[in-house]
């Protein structure tokens, strides 16, 4: 650090005093020098370090009329809001010449009530889950002891006794709130209280009860929720968008989900209007007067095929000689699943019904065995799915190949070429 | 509170059939849920035999299917299980237990009945 | 059929202490829904077993978390990070990717 020489006497006539406060405090260093001709300018020193931006003011007054008689030189040093790093030695130093000067020093210190330099925060935290909060203080003076409060109640018997910078909380079962008290020799500061929110536990256990082809039913177990009663639970589902879309702990859905609420218990709702034959994924979370649990994983179920809901479109059969000749189309209703193929039925007067599976043609040769003359014949039609045959059409009535002649009919199906 | 209750012999003869029954109460077998039969072999190997779903259809075990039968009883909201042609090698103890859908985890076990095959 | 096979047949570990458990399918039990059918039951002495992780990592109602689960495809771990004294019986890995649906042999887990 620069040194004032020996050889001549030092031209400060006023040092720099002591300033010891509590944070925030306002205070200011002065220091007085008288020199012969054009008065210097005074640099500040903290620790030996020049402060080059310094809030200080200088100011000169002349003791004579003659610019080369003594002048007195004030530098004052301003400090706003004193803080930790403001403290420390403090010199004036001014060059004279070829020999540097420095003054005697004098002190800042901080010295007050303990300062926060981490608080605790609010939080959310599910019921009976384990949480920690932080808080942090400092003085001088040191030592600073912490006691943490829960509720306004003490969880320790003395400052510095119980838990210091990290509270740890095993679990709440209702909302509380918690402040560090920072104790040292000046007194006692408060930090903020902290609100920490429990929110019920994340269900568990969601799964599939029962399905139908536009409906599901799902069950789960709920999670703790504390002294805080559940009010309903929320179920969303989203079309699985052919394996594109949710994959397993992905958080958010790619489009709007279906949400339905359930009031619990008990914890169980049924999903309905949902498409058959279709792949969903669907979460749950429940909610207390204190909030939202967090959601459940996303699961994949998905709906059953069912039957298709109408029968074949627009039958026509029509004979000729010992072949009839019938032919459909698709049904226009919804097939609530996969098409596997098309069962006719057929049934002449006096005669058994023959069931036929036609498999995924639209029209089939039925070859009349003997003369062909059968009364009264009547077809039907259904379509049918992995789950089942659909509704059969009305009967389509043939007309009688020989009046008042009845022999069994012996069906062929010819493949068309 | 779902609860599965087991009953039947806890003996049966070679070349006979052993039966039990799982009675449950808490949740009705035709509204949900797969019902299931396990046998856990002396040594503590565990088997999955089949089950009967809420809608009636069946699904058994491969290795049993020619001497298992699973059937219900919803008006008494009773499952049985049936198996035919037994020999010393099924003496085991048995649990029925409730299934989720679509991938089958059990989460509700009935207590056992410990059935010994022999003459 | 998918093969399950569990390591250590037994365990014998220290009140406290952590403890590991593992499990290998003989195929991937990673659906393409992104989901891991492996699930865990523990037995006790003289109980039916019970139903403890699904889906390789979830845990089922009640169970404390200082049980977990994790793994790839084929090779899993189900860890205790505190045994405790309620925590003996016979742990088994179980499959539910299809049926029939198989079983590990079991690991036995004891008090030192």
């Known amino acids: 650090a620069p040194r004032g020489t020996q050889a001549e006497e030092s031209p400060f006539v006023g040092n720099p005093g002591n300033i010891t406060g509590a944070r925030g405090l306002t205070g200011t260093l002065r220091c007085q020098l008288q020199v012969q001709g054009e008065p210097p300018e005074v640099h500040w020193l903290r620790d030996g370090q020049i402060l080059e931006l310094a809030d200080s003011t200088q100011t000169q007054v002349p003791l004579g009329e003659d610019e080369q008689d003594d002048w007195i030189v004030v530098s004052q040093l301003r400090i706003t809001s004193l803080q930790l790093s403001d403290t420390g030695q403090y010199q004036c130093l001014v060059f004279l010449g070829h020999q540097t000067f420095v003054s005697q020093p004098g002190y800042v210190g901080l010295e007050g009530l303990p300062y926060f330099l981490e608080e605790p925060e609010d939080r959310t935290v599910a019921a009976n889950t384990p949480f920690n909060l932080s808080c942090q203080a400092q003085g001088p003076p040191e030592p600073v002891d912490l006691l943490w409060l829960q509720d306004a109640v003490p969880l320790a018997t003395a400052p510095g006794h119980g838990p210091q910078r990290s509270l740890h909380v095993p679990g709440l079962n209702k909302t509380s709130s918690f402040s560090c008290e920072a104790h040292n020799a000046k007194g006692v500061t408060t930090s903020r209280t902290a609100t920490i929110t429990v929110l019920p536990q994340q269900p568990r256990n969601l799964h599939l009860v029962s399905r139908q082809p536009t409906e599901l039913e799902v069950a789960w177990t709920p999670g703790l929720s504390g002294i805080y009663p559940l009010t309903h639970c929320t179920l969303q589902a989203v079309l699985s968008d052919d394996g594109m879309g949710i994959q397993a702990g992905e958080p958010d859905p790619p489009e709007e989900p279906l949400t339905s609420q359930a009031s619990v218990p008990p914890h169980q709702l049924r999903l309905g209007s949902l498409h058959p034959h279709t792949p969903y994924h669907i979460r749950v979370a429940c909610t207390s007067s204190q909030g939202p649990s967090s959601w459940t994983h996303w699961l994949p179920v998905e709906t059953p095929e069912g039957v298709p809901l109408g029968p074949p479109e627009n039958i026509s059969a029509t004979r000729n000689g010992s072949q009839a000749f019938v032919h459909w189309q698709e049904p226009r209703a919804p097939l609530q699943g996969t098409l596997l193929g098309y069962r006719l039925a057929y049934q002449g007067q006096d005669t058994p019904e023959v069931l036929m599976d036609i498999g995924l043609r639209q029209e089939v040769t039925l070859e009349l065995q003997g003369d062909g003359s059968v009364s009264n014949l009547t077809v039907c039609v259904a379509a049918y799915t992995a789950a089942g045959d659909g509704p059969w059409s009305l009967p389509v009535p043939l007309e009688a190949w020989r009046p008042g002649q009845a022999q069994p009919v012996h069906q062929l199906v010819k493949e068309p070429s | 509170q779902v609860q599965l209750k087991q009953s039947g012999p806890g003996l049966v003869k070679p070349s006979q059939s052993l039966s039990l029954t799982c009675s449950v109460t808490?949740?009705?077998?035709?509204?949900?849920?797969?019902w299931n039969w396990i046998r856990q072999f002396p040594g503590n190997k565990l088997e999955w035999m089949g089950y009967?779903?809420?809608?009636?259809?069946?699904n058994y075990n491969p290795s049993l299917k020619n001497r298992i039968s699973i059937t219900r009883d919803t008006s008494k909201n009773q499952f049985f299980l049936k198996l035919n042609s037994v020999t010393t090698e099924d003496t085991a103890t048995y649990y029925c237990?409730?299934?989720?859908?679509?991938?089958?985890?059990?989460?509700?076990w009935g207590q056992g009945t410990s059935v010994t095959v022999s003459s | 059929e998918l093969v399950m096979t569990q390591s250590p047949f037994s365990n014998a570990v220290t009140l406290g202490t952590s403890a590991s458990i593992s499990c290998r399918s003989s195929?991937?039990?990673?659906?393409?829904?992104?989901?891991?059918?492996l699930y865990w039951y523990l037995q006790k002495p003289g109980q039916s077993p019970q139903l403890l992780i699904y889906?390789?990592?979830n845990l089922a109602s009640g169970v404390p978390d200082r049980f977990s689960s994790s793994g790839s495809g084929t090779d899993f771990t189900l860890r205790i990070s505190r045994v405790e004294a309620e925590d003996v019986g016979v742990y088994y890995c179980?499959?539910?990717?299809?049926?029939?649906?198989?079983f590990g042999a079991g690991t036995k887990l004891e008090l030192k």
């Open positions: 179980g499959q539910n990717l299809e049926l029939p649906l198989t």
């Open positions: 237990a409730r299934g989720w859908l679509l991938h089958y985890t059990m989460d509700y």
């Open positions: 195929r991937s039990l990673l659906h393409s829904n992104g989901f891991t059918y």
């Open positions: 009967r779903s809420y809608d009636g259809s069946n």
């Open positions: 889906q390789m990592s």
């Open positions: 808490g949740f009705s077998i035709s509204s949900g849920y797969y």
